[in-house]
């Protein structure tokens, strides 16, 4: 019996077409992604092969201007319009509190969304009761297929789930319910979920009983022959994995942001064994024309936006000094606005120990592109902000050791003076440049707010200690030379929309006034 | 639990023809096909057929002309039928999954006068 | 047809050996081949799928690999409950059995 799989994980807000790095579409001829034309793909499919599912494991919400406005309605609709089979719930899906989660999806969706470790305790458990689930059992062709759902235990540091849900270890929760479903006689098992590549293959090592893994938030790309575009494979797909009782389980990721549908056959056996399994991602380029009726309800649903871009968000009764001259060069105010945006955007006071699980920000000045002039009745609006972060990045949580830190500052002024993008601006960070010295040895003091304190004060960096940094996804991938990032972090989680992070904390403070105030010397 | 249990004659006379049923628990015949197996007495594993989850059948070439397999979708049954029997088709008969999964405990089938 | 070449066809040996049993296959058979264990009451049983998965409560002292035509079974330490017929089935194609290799007590 032959089971096709399609799924998504980590789309991020793409509901239109977008450029080929995921950014805005311009030259709509070279666009890829959108749910018009992830529709027309399915529906192909669909019509082609007797047994399919779709699922996406997660990171629907959060990423472009989509989100900002509509807070998740739009992923419910465009998901119900799709007829995606089961979601599992990622770490920004709780973005807006589970509020934000309760009412525009889960109570919208007309499809199961699931996870297994996630428990829900006190007043919440009653009101959240049965709008998520641990697992479903979905009817397919004669057979039927049990899917698990988990998502990472990490959130409560990622997102806003508050305190009434409680995130378990992932393989601890998975395995009762797998258990569950044999004992209700259902022998085909997909794990859905939301942890990232390496949970997902020890969920396919440790959990007895699963068959299948497709996963999500590591952005993995898994191929299989010539990769179709600029993505670099980290694996084979399906990427296999020997369990522990000697099956072997493919597991799946299809890189993110809807720019491919991921595509995987599994032949099962009379007792539910995985015979075989093939399949690949499918770029979904322009060859593959946008379904008209979706792109004709995307284009109705998209007017609300364009209205929002230019609606106040707060004011500004300073200069917002975004400018090459002065960001590339020398700390500047809009870097400092950046960067405390991103630290607010990151509080979580997840234990008493700790006043915030991340104090510090990096943020490469050559990502900053353009000032905001306050003689416009200091009014910020979002266009404003996307001419200073254009890129749709987002702003992301690493961990790294002092001695990569120190390395990155070491390569902020290596090569001083010239305009280049590299010269960080900071937050949560005091450092002091001797730009005599030569380029590798320049950085004579480093100090860093501690975070495991009550009263927030600043001490030198320790080379063996790890830190938690918030920083911009283009330097945790290594971008501006920043390579050591790239190949030191010891953990990487990707955030929110860069402009979102900004424009959500102008919003808050509602006048701001950012200075330059010496975390640069 | 997936189980198959074949039944039908242990003695049949030459010429006569062997009609034997496989009875499926545990998963469906319109998504797994029933592949059938014999083992003459000391001898090898031999395929005689199978029948696939749409109702096609495959056979054996060397038993092409005188194999049948058939089946009942709601009653989970499978019949083979194998006409003008000889002594040499004294063998041990199994059904088994499309895959291999499960089989038959086998039944004995003699062809003696 | 796919010819399938099994060997041996008998071995002896004792409690704890390490047991190995080849198949070869006429063509190209890409990984679509069990390990079917035959007591002497002729009771069939799965061992491993598709070359090299262990199928629910087998032991994991059993062993497969091999890819295109050739493939191996293995018994890491032979156990008492382990002497019977193994077969290598091919499903590639119409099925195909190898001859069977019967294992014995020393």
């Known amino acids: 019996w032959e089971l096709t799989i399609l799924h998504t994980n980590d789309v991020h807000s793409r509901l239109e077409q977008t450029s080929e790095d995921s950014s805005k579409c311009v030259n709509a001829s070279r666009c890829m992604g959108g749910v018009a034309r992830l529709f027309t793909k399915v529906q192909q499919i669909r019509r082609a092969e007797p047994n399919v599912l779709l699922l996406d494991a997660g990171d629907q919400y959060q990423g472009t201007i989509w989100f900002t406005v509509y807070k998740g309605a739009e992923v419910a609709h465009f998901m119900n319009a799709l007829r995606y089979d089961a979601m599992a719930l990622g770490n920004h899906e709780f973005d807006n509190g589970v509020e934000g989660l309760i009412e525009p999806l889960l109570k919208e969706a007309k499809f199961p969304i699931l996870s297994a470790n996630i428990k829900a305790k006190g007043p919440l458990a009653s009101q959240i009761s049965g709008l998520y689930l641990p697992y479903k059992v979905l009817p397919v062709g004669d057979e039927v297929v049990g899917i698990v759902g988990y998502t990472s235990k990490e959130t409560p540091f990622l997102s806003n789930p508050g305190t009434n849900l409680v995130f378990e270890d992932e393989i601890t929760a998975l395995q009762p319910e797998v258990d569950k479903l044999k004992t209700l006689n259902v022998n085909k098992i997909i794990a859905l979920g939301h942890s990232g590549f390496e949970m997902d293959k020890l969920i396919a090592q440790k959990v007895r009983g699963v068959d299948v893994v497709v996963g999500g938030h590591s952005n993995t790309f898994l191929y299989t022959g010539n990769p179709p575009s600029k993505e670099v494979p980290a694996g084979k797909y399906p990427f296999i994995v020997t369990s522990d009782d000697g099956r072997k389980v493919p597991v799946v990721q299809a890189y993110a942001f809807g720019k491919y549908l991921g595509y995987l056959k599994i032949e099962f056996d009379e007792r539910g064994n995985v015979i075989s399994s093939h399949g690949n991602p499918i770029l979904l380029n322009s060859s593959i024309p946008e379904d008209p009726s979706i792109k004709a309800d995307i284009n109705k649903w998209r007017i609300k936006l364009d209205n929002y871009s230019t609606q106040e968000l707060g004011k500004t009764i300073v200069y917002l000094d975004g400018s090459s001259q002065s960001c590339r060069f020398r700390e500047c105010n809009m870097g400092n606005l950046i960067c405390d945006a991103m630290i607010n955007n990151n509080l979580r006071h997840t234990d008493e120990m700790f006043w915030n699980h991340v104090s510090m920000c990096i943020l490469n000045g050559g990502g900053i592109r353009s000032p905001i002039d306050e003689r416009n009745n200091g009014t910020i609006t979002w266009e404003n902000l996307a001419a200073v972060l254009p890129f749709g990045g987002t702003f992301d949580l690493v961990q790294l050791k002092g001695s990569t830190l120190k390395k990155a500052f070491e390569h902020s002024v290596h090569r001083y003076g010239q305009s280049t993008g590299e010269f960080l601006q900071v937050g949560g960070i005091h450092v002091v440049y001797d730009l005599s010295r030569k380029p590798g040895d320049r950085v004579v003091k480093l100090d860093v707010l501690c975070t495991k304190c009550r009263v927030p004060s600043y001490d030198p960096l320790k080379m063996d200690e790890v830190y938690k940094v918030i920083l911009p996804n283009f330097l945790a991938n290594g971008g501006d030379g920043f390579q050591m990032i790239k190949d030191e972090l010891l953990r990487h989680d990707s955030g929110d929309q860069d402009i979102n992070v900004v424009s959500t904390y102008i919003s808050k403070m509602k006048v701001i006034y950012p200075a330059v105030e010496g975390r640069i010397k | 639990e997936v189980t198959l249990k074949e039944s039908g004659p242990v003695l049949v006379k030459p010429t006569e023809t062997l009609t034997l049923t496989c009875t499926v628990s545990?998963?469906?015949?319109?998504?797994?096909?029933i592949q059938w197996v014999r083992q003459p007495p000391g001898k090898l594993l031999e395929w005689l057929g199978v029948?696939?989850?749409?109702?096609?059948?495959d056979y054996n070439a060397a038993f092409i002309s005188r194999l049948t397999i058939s089946k009942d979708t709601s009653k989970s049954q499978v019949v083979l039928t194998m006409t003008n029997m000889d002594p040499v088709d004294t063998a041990t008969y199994y059904c088994?999954?499309?895959?291999?999964?499960?089989w038959g405990q086998g039944t004995l089938v003699t062809v003696s006068s | 047809d796919i010819q399938m070449t099994q060997s041996p066809s008998s071995l002896s040996a004792s409690v704890g050996d390490r047991v190995t049993i080849t198949c070869r296959a006429s063509?190209?058979?890409?990984?679509?081949l069990n390990w079917l264990q035959q007591k002497p009451g002729g009771a069939i049983k799965r061992l491993i799928y598709?070359?090299?998965s262990l199928d629910s409560g087998v032991p994991k002292r059993f062993s497969g690999s091999g890819s295109g035509t050739e493939y191996t079974l293995t018994i890491s330490s032979l156990q008492p409950e382990d002497f019977a017929t193994y077969y290598c089935?091919?499903?590639?194609?119409?099925?195909?059995f190898g001859g069977g290799t019967k294992v014995e007590i020393k």
């Open positions: 089935l091919q499903y590639a194609g119409s099925w195909t």
């Open positions: 029948i696939w989850s749409g109702g096609s059948a």
């Open positions: 598709a070359t090299s």
């Open positions: 545990g998963f469906s015949l319109s998504s797994y096909g």
């Open positions: 088994a999954g499309q895959y291999g999964s499960v």
């Open positions: 063509q190209d058979i890409g990984d679509r």
